[in-house]
Interface confidence: low
Amino acid sequence: EAHKSEIAHRFKDLGEQHFKGLVLIAFSQYLQKCPYEEHIKLVQEVTDFAKTCVADENAENCDKSIHTLFGDKLCAIPKLRDNYGELADCCAKQEPERNECFLQHKDDNPNLPPFQRPEAEAMCTSFQENPTSFLGHYLHEVARRHPYFYAPELLYYAEKYNEVLTQCCTESDKAACLTPKLDAVKEKALVAAVRQRMKCSSMQRFGERAFKAWAVARMSQRFPNAEFAEITKLATDVTKINKECCHGDLLECADDRAELAKYMCENQATISSKLQACCDKPVLQKSQCLAEIEHDNIPADLPSIAADFVEDKEVCKNYAEAKDVFLGTFLYEYSRRHPDYSVSLLLRLAKKYEATLEKCCAEGDPPACYGTVLAEFQPLVEEPKNLVKTNCELYEKLGEYGFQNAVLVRYTQKAPQVSTPTLVEAARNLGRVGTKCCTLPEAQRLPCVEDYLSAILNRLCVLHEKTPVSEKVTKCCSGSLVERRPCFSALTVDETYVPKEFKAETFTFHSDICTLPDKEKQIKKQTALAELVKHKPKATEDQLKTVMGDFAQFVDKCCKAADKDNCFATEGPNLVARSKEALA
């Protein structure tokens, strides 16, 4: 239904608090370098304007689109060109080209310092003095570092942040209460960021049809008792919502997400028996709960999938009549029977099925040709199952840090041209898959591992796209989204790579390493490891183990020394010499 004033409509639907939060996220994701104070000023102006439109929808400019209103605000910022360079050129364009232009200038790796959490006491003081400003800073800092973060979900994390601070700031040992709880929120939010980036990549590169296929598979796994038509409706809505958020239409996205949650709660009988607990919650928590909902129980009497899709004599007729609907029903039927498969695997199977029908339905005896299609799925299923088995075994043997190092060596050998910080970030994230997934029950491991790896590899692709350096990475990243993970897994040592010359300064360390937090210490060591592999791509596992063990001992010894600086200065060159020798 059309509204005279789009901005008034969204303000009324969302309420002032959520409206302001979403406008702040939108501005922070578009102009990532602007300070909080500048953005909050714009947010207040937009909010005041929205209120005038609520009071009178016919007031001047109230009929303008939200993109027009937001874009005009951004383009009115003084010194826009000085701070943002060619992004200022977007302002010469008209909508919708102007918004498209802003989207193209979003930076996935902005040159911003890592978000430092203040010390507990200071945090509680500023939170208690002005909770709204404190949480506004949180939204701003996360949104500018993650320009595709799913806005309604970020509001949910801000709410969680608020809950933790409210609870912990009254405790005597604030740090002991805050640290684990905020770490948990941060971990969840970081995973949410890479997952959403993957969704936006899917939408940007492959369009709505590909995203909708992903949504059909996911929904069918979660709601195996829902009819195909119901799943189609949910997938259509989820596709629209994600398209809006990925496209910067954050107010519409959040509003539609709340509408979908309402619809699901009003139609539990036809969707899932597991929704009730979510439906009793307030709006942000309700949507988040529904997004994370456990799978419903699979109906007991499901017939074999072969009946409709292999044995039925009408397969080719049904396929020819309505290809998308027929393939959609196949994806639905297969997915609802397999909550133990990853969405990527289910989409690969659907693609294989489609290719088989395309080939066989053009032949003389189609049923004989496609009759073996389900058996041909076997190797496609075995490949990720083996990946999970070998990687989880390795994780159990080495622990998270050791497993990250193994992954780092593997990926540096596959793509040594990629910058060391990017390789270290990717390997650390890929390595976390062990902790995240390998401890889960068997039936949940494969979907957890493969869908998480796909999201992390998408981040690698997004960063690599900015400055392409490896042909192999470009090849894996340009192909289909669901084939990326198998493509990366299949990469071997890059034989074309000319090893980096050994630079002593790369392996020279100082006493400042001793005071670093554990995480930063690990990153320093992993940076050195990647550089070693770039110097000797064919170094054996034993050689690398020797050098890294020697390095760890050196750091440990010098950090315990009375004169740390002297120890690093004298022992460092010896370590470098020993390492060169070990790798010769």
Partner: nanobody
């Protein structure tokens, strides 16, 4: 508020055909999930066929698949059920039901349809 009015029922011989119509008012039919249900004497009301609102996907009960076709004419705001190869067991009162929404889809659960017509009787007998 949606008003539904069925027509087209009657007596037909086994193997014959009939076309039922359901005229809707008060709401555009393309924004609404609509379905045909039937109730034979002494039996429960059962789902026959449905078509989505906004998502043009049709859904059929196994017992009528290949014989019955559901369709709608948005310009006339009317739903149809074309019934071919009729059998004696198809004898029942046929009801048209609507489930508005944006876009709502078909469901086999009768309770989820708030709007119903008064029904039209179909008798298949020689």
């Amino acid at each position: 508020e949606v008003q539904l009015l069925e027509s087209g029922g009657g007596l037909v011989q086994p193997g014959g055909s009939l076309r039922l119509s359901c005229a809707a008012s008060g709401r555009y039919i393309d924004e609404t999930a609509v379905a045909w249900f039937r109730q034979a004497p002494g039996k429960e009301r059962e789902f026959v066929a449905g078509i989505g609102g906004g998502v043009d996907i049709t859904y059929y009960a196994d017992s009528v698949k290949g014989r019955f076709t559901i369709s709608r004419d948005n310009s006339k705001n009317t739903l149809y059920l074309q019934m071919n190869s009729l059998r004696p067991e198809d004898t029942a009162v046929y009801y048209c039901a609507a489930r508005p929404g944006k876009p709502l889809i078909t469901s086999k659960v009768a309770d989820l349809y708030p709007y119903w017509g008064q029904g039209t009787l179909v008798t298949v007998s020689s």
